[in-house]
Interface confidence: medium
């Protein structure tokens, strides 16, 4: 009788990574003949919440208005029309900062380093931890894993850059998480400033942060070379 | 105002093929769905399959095997096509816009008549 | 699917007098969304069908107010007051609620 409905398509306002106590509204956009939408959390009981669609019936708001622990986890989203359910959307991963202190993200030998050259960022945790995330800002692809195996807990992660080219230039910082829920994040380390000088076989400038522009190189996934400095951390690409 | 015109062949043999054009006007096709419902001489109404807005569609599960609705959304025309008939599809075949509040028909075509006959 | 038993089949009432049609439905037409999707059709000779009322009892625009339709679940009411000569034709009931969507058999107006 029905061919399947076509997905929809969910996604976060103001963005998928929401600091403790912040608001987040999540949208589910479906079709005008929607009925109503159903939001699934992943090991909650389905449905997680129920709406009837906004006019004109082709989208629905769900409303989180101080993010906590509980809401951190990955969601999926329904609508219903005449003919009944449709696909699930892609995956929505919702994800808390502010769960665990600071880390400290420093550039080793220094943050000003010569294209060409190598550069370690090191983020350090005051507690253990298994996971550690760097994030590039205004990257499209901003995560690089660094989790522990056999649940070894670390102080620490490099995340070796060799060799540096005037695309690393940028802002970063980093993340430490436990890994029973990479859904919840510390609080950000304070930013890092990551400067390339001297890019004499690149003679791009070092893309300006101020303006965000079309997709760059800047926008791939930051893809350090080398080992991984320590034994009991494997690398995860996101 | 809104407006739906059905046109097509009006005496078709039987296991011959017909194809139906509604055109609209009032209205876009990118926002509302368009239902098709045919009434046989002196019977009742029988809905047989809709477009949506998005272009999905769905069927009549007695006769979704011999039935195709599309759509051009540019030119406003959605299209019924309808194989293999027989003498009992004789009737009046409307197109009708989907109203989206009440899920209901709002508008109507004023139909086209059909007669399959040797 | 959901059969739609409309009584009468026939209806005679004389001009000014009430008409009342009757509608069940095989299920309970009361959606998860909370709202009842049974609509009613008037369907003069020689004419397309016309949509007199929506969600169980909304007049379309352009519909008199002697009309009233009520009811909920499976039993529904197309009531018109005081019947007039162009209030004769043909009167169906059809839900929306479940795919696929079904017309009642229909019910004929006519002048005593």
């Known amino acids: 009788q029905a061919g399947p409905l076509p997905k929809p398509t969910l996604w976060a306002e103001p963005g998928s990574v929401i600091s403790w106590g912040n608001s987040v509204t999540i949208w589910c956009q479906g079709t005008l003949e929607a009925r109503e939408y159903r939001l699934d959390k992943e090991e909650s009981p389905a449905p997680w919440d129920r709406q009837n669609p906004l006019e004109p019936k082709n989208k629905a708001r769900f409303s989180i208005p101080s993010m906590t622990e509980d809401y951190a986890g990955r969601y999926r989203c329904y609508y219903r029309s005449p003919v009944g359910w449709s696909q699930p959307s892609d995956p929505l991963e919702l994800v808390m900062t502010g769960a665990y202190s600071k880390p400290t993200l420093s550039a080793l030998p220094s943050p000003l380093v010569t294209s060409g050259k190598s550069v370690t960022l090191l983020c350090q945790s005051r507690s253990p931890m298994d996971t550690f995330l760097l994030i590039k800002e205004r990257a499209a692809h901003p995560l690089l894993h660094l989790r522990s195996e056999h649940g070894a807990q670390q102080h620490q992660a490099e995340f070796p850059m060799s060799p540096v080219t005037s695309v690393h230039g940028g802002t970063y910082r980093c993340f430490s998480s436990h890994g029973f829920s990479h859904y919840l994040l510390s609080h950000p380390s304070d930013p890092l400033e990551l400067i390339v000088s001297g890019s004499l076989e690149d003679p791009r400038p070092s893309p300006t942060r101020s303006v965000s522009t079309a997709a760059g190189p800047e926008d791939q996934p930051l893809m350090p070379t080398g080992s991984v400095p320590h034994s009991g951390l494997r690398r995860h690409w996101e | 105002q809104v407006q739906l015109k059905e046109s097509g062949p009006v005496l078709v043999a039987p296991s011959q093929s017909l194809s139906i054009t509604c055109t609209v006007s009032g209205f876009s096709l990118t926002n509302s769905a368009v239902h098709w419902v045919r009434q046989p001489p002196g019977k009742g109404l029988e809905w047989l399959g809709v477009?949506?807005?998005?272009?999905?569609?769905n069927y009549n599960s007695t006769l979704m095997s011999r039935l195709t609705i599309n759509k051009d959304n540019s030119k406003s025309q959605v299209f019924l096509r309808m194989n293999s008939l027989q003498t009992d599809d004789t009737a009046i075949y409307y197109c009708a816009k989907h109203e989206t509040y009440g899920d209901s028909f709002d508008y109507w075509g004023q139909g086209t008549t059909l007669t399959v006959s040797s | 699917d959901v059969v739609m038993t409309q009584t009468p089949l026939t209806l005679s009432v004389t001009i000014g007098q009430p008409a009342s049609i009757s509608c069940r439905s095989s299920q309970s037409l009361l959606d998860s969304d909370g709202k009842t999707y049974l609509n009613w059709l008037f369907q003069r000779p020689g004419q397309s069908p016309k949509r007199l009322i929506y969600?169980?009892?909304k007049l379309d625009s352009g519909v008199p107010d002697r009309f009233t339709g009520s009811g909920s679940g499976t039993d529904f009411t197309l009531k018109i007051s005081r019947v007039e000569a162009e209030d004769l034709g043909v009167y169906y009931c059809w839900q929306g609620t479940h795919f696929p969507f079904t017309f009642g058999s229909g019910t004929k107006l006519e002048i005593k």
């Open positions: 969600l169980v009892s």
């Open positions: 477009i949506w807005a998005g272009g999905n569609t």
